[in-house]
């Protein structure tokens, strides 16, 4: 019997300081560029090595960005979202959604080293 894949969804506020070359990440998504099926949200597609986001360490590829400096990213064209980040100022507050994949074993299964066995 195969395990079931579940997702643990958490939200976090991440405050970044714009570095010499900006925020240091790429995005996909938007109403005109749906990267995830049936979801026009904005997602992190790449984090630049040694950029501001990478040095902070909390933002991850695959994270969904819900807001920038309190401004909701719902129903935005892709380029409008890009421009929002580029014009967000020196101190940038991101509300992000992390989606962690969790592998669940079959019901009733106990691992070999399970102390409750």
């Amino acid at each position: 019997m195969n395990g079931r894949v579940d997702y643990l969804v958490t939200e976090e506020e991440i405050n970044l300081t714009r570095g010499p070359s900006g925020l240091g990440f790429n995005i996909v998504g938007g109403t005109d560029q749906q990267y995830v099926s049936n979801d026009s949200g904005i997602y992190v597609s790449r984090i630049k090595e040694n950029g501001a986001a990478a040095l902070d360490g909390r933002l991850q590829e695959g994270d969904k960005i819900l807001s920038v400096n309190g401004q909701d990213l719902k129903n935005l064209l892709h380029q409008d979202a890009v421009d929002l980040f580029r014009n967000a100022g020196y101190a940038v507050s991101l509300r992000v959604q992390h989606r962690l994949q969790v592998q669940n074993g079959p019901i009733g299964h106990r691992g070999e080293g399970d102390p409750s066995g």
Epitope: G22, L23, F25, V28, R46, K48, N50, V82
Partner: nanobody, 127 residues
Framework: DVQLVESGGGLVQAGGSLRLSCAAS????????MGWFRQAPGLERDFVAE????????GYADSVKGRFTISRDNAKNTVYLQMNSLKPQDTAVYYC?????????????????????WGQGTQVTVS
């Protein structure tokens, strides 16, 4: 992943024109930001031009503004660099590059570290 193959390089006289092409393989080409870089012997790979996923936004190095034009055809999975008024200092190997998504940083700061996928390059020589 994306594979990139450049073509269109060659020898041209100063003041002449060339059009470089970069053919990309990959199903999600339209989600990629595409760029051109160049590298002269003994020098670093320098940013030349960049185009957004749908062609709506472009950026250029100061040294090529007004002379070079970047464009793309997502139906053909191809990006182009039209180079006019070529100068001897434009002589270099020209590389096509791709990265998934759109950088949230202005192209004023673009470097080779911003791109993940590269072609093998095509030589442009201006005499």
């Amino acid at each position: 992943d994306v594979q990139l193959v450049e073509s269109g390089g060659g020898l041209v006289q100063a003041g002449g024109s060339l059009r470089l092409s970069c053919a990309a393989s990959g199903r999600t080409f339209s989600s990629y930001t595409m760029g051109w870089f160049r590298q002269a012997p003994g020098l670093e790979r320098d940013f030349v031009a960049e185009i957004s996923w749908n062609g709506g936004s472009t950026g250029y190095a100061d040294s090529v503004k007004g002379r070079f034009t970047i464009s793309r055809d997502n139906a053909k999975n191809t990006v182009y660099l039209q180079m006019n008024s070529l100068k001897p200092q434009d002589t270099a190997v020209y590389y096509c590059a791709a990265v998934i998504g759109s950088p949230t940083d202005s192209s004023d700061y673009r470097s080779s570290l911003d791109y993940d996928y590269w072609g093998q390059g095509t030589q442009v020589t201006v005499s």
